[in-house]
Interface confidence: low
């Protein structure tokens, strides 16, 4: 494909998430709780998520031989989610990375939420056309992912407090993922 433009739509995707969901994994629900924010007086059960960026992408789709006649517009979900207690840090507050629980086994990732299916026409070099049915992303959300214990997590502690948005979140595959992987 060819990316013509990617515009940051970021507008605080704020989604309440249950503090203690079922431990059983289901198609639309990731496992267990969010990363705990330790050493603060803030409520650990507060799990409103912020900071999930939605990027608006305009691109042409190609299957190798044929290219879309008109560009496809969709959202791209950027990979950061921050629990509410980190927000002061993210907007320039004084919290540092040391407040992240070293032992927590939960992580967050910004993933696809809502999608829609559409048909797109591709023009081929020999003059013929092909029609594909694809699913494009229309909204993003924060998704919880439980990693197995004993994974390396030293990078969380080594990041600079000056750039708190850099707390990376591991991810659990969203069940409503984009059904075309051209991007």
């Amino acid at each position: 494909f060819k990316n013509d433009a990617t515009e940051i739509l970021y507008s605080h995707v704020v989604k309440p998430v249950p503090a203690h969901p079922s431990s059983n994994s289901t198609l639309n629900q990731a496992r267990n709780g969010g990363r705990h924010f330790s050493n603060t007086g803030l409520d650990r059960n507060t799990r409103v998520q912020v900071g999930c960026r939605e990027l608006r992408s305009t691109k042409y789709i190609s299957d190798g031989q044929c290219t879309s006649i008109s560009p496809l517009k969709e959202l791209v979900c950027a990979g950061e989610c921050l629990p509410l207690p980190v927000l002061p840090n993210w907007i320039g507050g004084g919290y540092g990375t040391k407040y992240w629980s070293r032992r927590s086994s939960q992580e967050w990732r910004c993933v696809n939420d809502k999608t829609r299916t559409q048909r797109i026409q591709l023009q081929c070099q020999d003059g013929s056309t092909r029609t594909y049915k694809i699913t494009v992303v229309t909204a993003c959300k924060c998704k919880r992912y439980t990693r197995q214990h004993n994974e390396s997590s030293h990078n969380f502690e080594s990041m600079s407090p000056a750039k708190p948005v850099q707390h990376h979140r591991e991810r659990k595959r969203a069940s409503k993922s984009s059904k075309h992987s051209m991007s």
Epitope: T6, A78, S152, H167, E170, K172, R173, A174, S177
Partner: antibody, heavy 118, light 107 residues
Framework: QVQLVQSGAEVKKPGSSVKVSCKAS????????ISWVRQAPGQGLEWMGW????????RYNRKFTGRVTITADESTSTAYMELSSLRSEDTAVYYC???????????WGQGTLVTVSS | DIQLTQSPFSLSASVGDRVTITCRAS??????LNWYLQKPGKAPKLLIF???TSQSGVPSRFSGNGFGTDFSLIISGLQPEDVGTYYC?????????FGQGTRLDIK
């Protein structure tokens, strides 16, 4: 079109380190996950770890923790995988792979053969 | 870690045959299972992701199904270019793991 181009083959001594590069083109590098996967001769695929290019956040397979370091340089759209304390069993083709939406590997580099031999 | 066991280890089939490769996970991974084809001397190529979704540009004769612990890759109408080693891979939990591979060749 997304492309991942890796550095050339390396021959290393046991105990030394190797650093393999993976230059990405097409797409937005900063919002991608780059994983490293290795394949010993005649063997299967083994995931080593990934980096989220936009932040430098990493996660490693615990089998390699302490020996592998994955980094990224946004200015050149290049990811790196450094493996230290090499031993003969680290002889393998090392692939970088760009993840799709969440944990499947949509695009792959051509592979870099690392041979560890005394 | 989650173990993935593929079967058969290898198989030979004729052009036009329907071929099924299975992948069993050591614990439930929902639909977080992907399939790749690796040809000799080449990098793997994504065929199917999320258990049943075809990657763009992959021929329609490739399909996938399954949920939980048991998954299948089906090739409906084997073609000569389908030879190679097929791998399943789970992305349900870290570390991501692959099956040991199934080698497919033409009779």
């Amino acid at each position: 079109q997304v492309q991942l181009v890796q550095s050339g083959a390396e021959v290393k001594k046991p105990g030394s380190s190797v650093k393999v590069s993976c230059k990405a083109s097409g797409g937005t590098f900063s919002s991608t996950y780059i994983s490293w996967v290795r394949q010993a001769p005649g063997q299967g695929l083994e995931w080593m770890g990934w980096i989220y290019a936009g932040t430098g956040g990493t996660r490693y397979n615990r089998k390699f923790t302490g020996r592998v370091t994955i980094t990224a340089d946004e200015s050149t759209s290049t990811a790196y995988m450094e493996l230290s304390s090499l031993r003969s069993e680290d002889t393998a083709v090392y692939y970088c792979a760009r993840e799709g939406v969440d944990g499947w590997f949509t695009y792959w580099g051509q592979g870099t053969l690392v041979t560890v031999s005394s | 870690d989650i173990q993935l066991t593929q079967s058969p280890f290898s198989l030979s089939a004729s052009v036009g045959d329907r071929v099924t490769i299975t992948c069993r996970a050591s614990q439930s991974i929902n639909d977080n299972l992907n399939w790749y084809l690796q040809k000799p001397g080449k990098a793997p190529k994504l065929l199917i992701f999320a258990a049943s979704t075809s990657q763009s540009g992959v021929p329609s004769r490739f399909s996938g199904n399954g949920f939980g612990t048991d998954f299948s890759l089906i090739i409906s109408g084997l073609q000569p270019e389908d030879v190679g080693t097929y791998y399943c891979q789970q992305n349900d939990s870290m570390p991501f793991t692959f099956g040991q591979g199934t080698r497919l060749d033409i009779k």
